[in-house]
């Protein structure tokens, strides 16, 4: 079985150093060798994944899973219920939204259940991994004759969230970007009627509630301008 | 290769306060997870605060709301603010370091760091 796990691009750094370097190779136990790294997104705080890199071991291992939360009701240590497989080997958990409490210590032990001295415990701020899902239903009203502006909607709570506005026109090489705060809506004061224009958006959960670095994928794009115009001056929604 | 040097312990007397610092050569501190450790005598080491090199900060319960950790990574150090010092802080400490793929990685576990201080002797009196 293998599992498709949705993490963002360019999350992942390859180049950390192996770390028993401390260590002649030739001392090595089985329980000496460093297992790999858990990383956790909590995906618009309805489920959470927390992966690792099973092809790192250096036989298949089933590695095992738990969890807890650190100072609070929740600190019973939990077994993973629900595991995501890479060729038939553990190489994630996920757990479900009542599983999941954002502003208290989350601390994950992943287990090599062959070895059960073999094991890592690594501590998480849950609020600073929320990737929320990707904007939605963009319009853009007519203001007037040179203005529009931009609206969207997001499938969580809209003051949590920080937004980022790119556009361009068909003239252009690249992106103009804008980054929007909670309000969720964007002004273009000067637009020129001659142009056809693309406007995307994409958002993060930052910095009100909570302190993530990874945004949600981009919105699927709208379009505004000269072949738009004339079907409707004042309303265009999305064109996927 | 990381080479850890802790300072800065000693004698204090209870509710005292000690600044622990640990310098590290051989490479940056970029991409690493540090570590502050504690052994007692004929007790197991134990973590007292880790951080991780995108900046998130963890606790031990018995030292929350004491003990500070900060990072210098312009001059390669990381330190302990040690604040009301009680006598069950007798310990040697330990800086450790582990390079992590993750910014968000930040080990509780002594056996999931490659580098290792020497470390320094805090004792706390009555």
């Known amino acids: 079985l293998n599992t498709t796990i949705l993490t963002p691009n360019g999350n992942e750094d390859t180049t950390a150093d192996f770390f028993l370097t401390t260590m002649p190779t030739d001392s090595l136990s089985v329980s000496t060798l460093p297992l790999p790294e858990v990383q956790c997104f909590v995906f618009n705080v309805e489920y959470m994944n927390c992966t690792w890199n099973s092809s790192s071991e250096p036989q298949p291992t089933n590695l095992t899973l738990h969890y807890w939360y650190k100072n609070s009701d929740n600190d019973k240590v939990q077994k993973c219920s629900h595991y995501l497989f890479s060729e038939e080997i553990t190489s994630g958990c996920q757990l479900q939204k009542k599983e999941i409490h954002l502003y208290q210590t989350f601390v994950v032990q992943l287990q090599d259940p062959r070895e059960p001295r073999r094991q890592a415990t690594q501590m998480l701020k849950l609020q600073n991994l929320v990737i929320p899902w990707a904007p939605e239903n963009l319009t853009l009203h007519k203001l007037s004759e040179s203005q529009l502006e931009l609206n969207w909607n997001n499938r969580f709570l809209n003051h949590c969230l920080e937004h980022l506005v790119q556009y361009r026109t068909d003239w252009d090489h690249s992106w103009t970007e804008q980054s929007v705060d909670y309000r969720h809506k964007f002004s273009l004061p000067s637009v020129d009627g001659q142009k056809r224009y693309t406007f995307r958006v994409r958002s993060r959960f930052n910095p009100l509630c909570g302190s993530a670095q990874h945004w949600s994928e981009w919105s699927h794009p709208i379009h505004w301008g000269s072949n738009t115009s004339k079907e409707n001056p004042f309303l265009f929604a999305l064109e996927a | 290769q990381v080479q850890l040097v802790e300072s800065g312990g000693g004698l204090v007397q209870a509710g005292g306060s000690l600044r622990l610092s640990c310098a590290a050569s051989?490479?940056?501190?970029?991409?690493?997870?540090m570590g502050w450790f504690r052994q007692a005598p004929g007790k197991e080491r134990e973590f007292v605060a880790v951080?991780?090199?995108?900046?998130?900060?963890f606790y031990a319960d018995s030292v929350e709301g004491r003990f500070t950790y900060s990072r210098d990574n312009a001059k390669s150090a990381v330190y302990l603010q040690m604040n009301s010092l009680q006598p069950e802080d007798t310990a040697v400490y330990y800086c450790?370091?582990?390079?992590?793929?993750?910014?968000?990685?930040?080990?509780?576990?002594?056996?999931?760091?490659?580098?290792w201080g020497q470390g320094t002797q805090v004792t706390v009196s009555s």
């Open positions: 450790a370091a582990a390079p992590t793929s993750f910014a968000t990685t930040a080990y509780s576990s002594s056996n999931s760091y490659a580098y």
């Open positions: 051989g490479r940056t501190l970029s991409r690493l997870a």
């Open positions: 951080n991780s090199w995108g900046g998130d900060t």
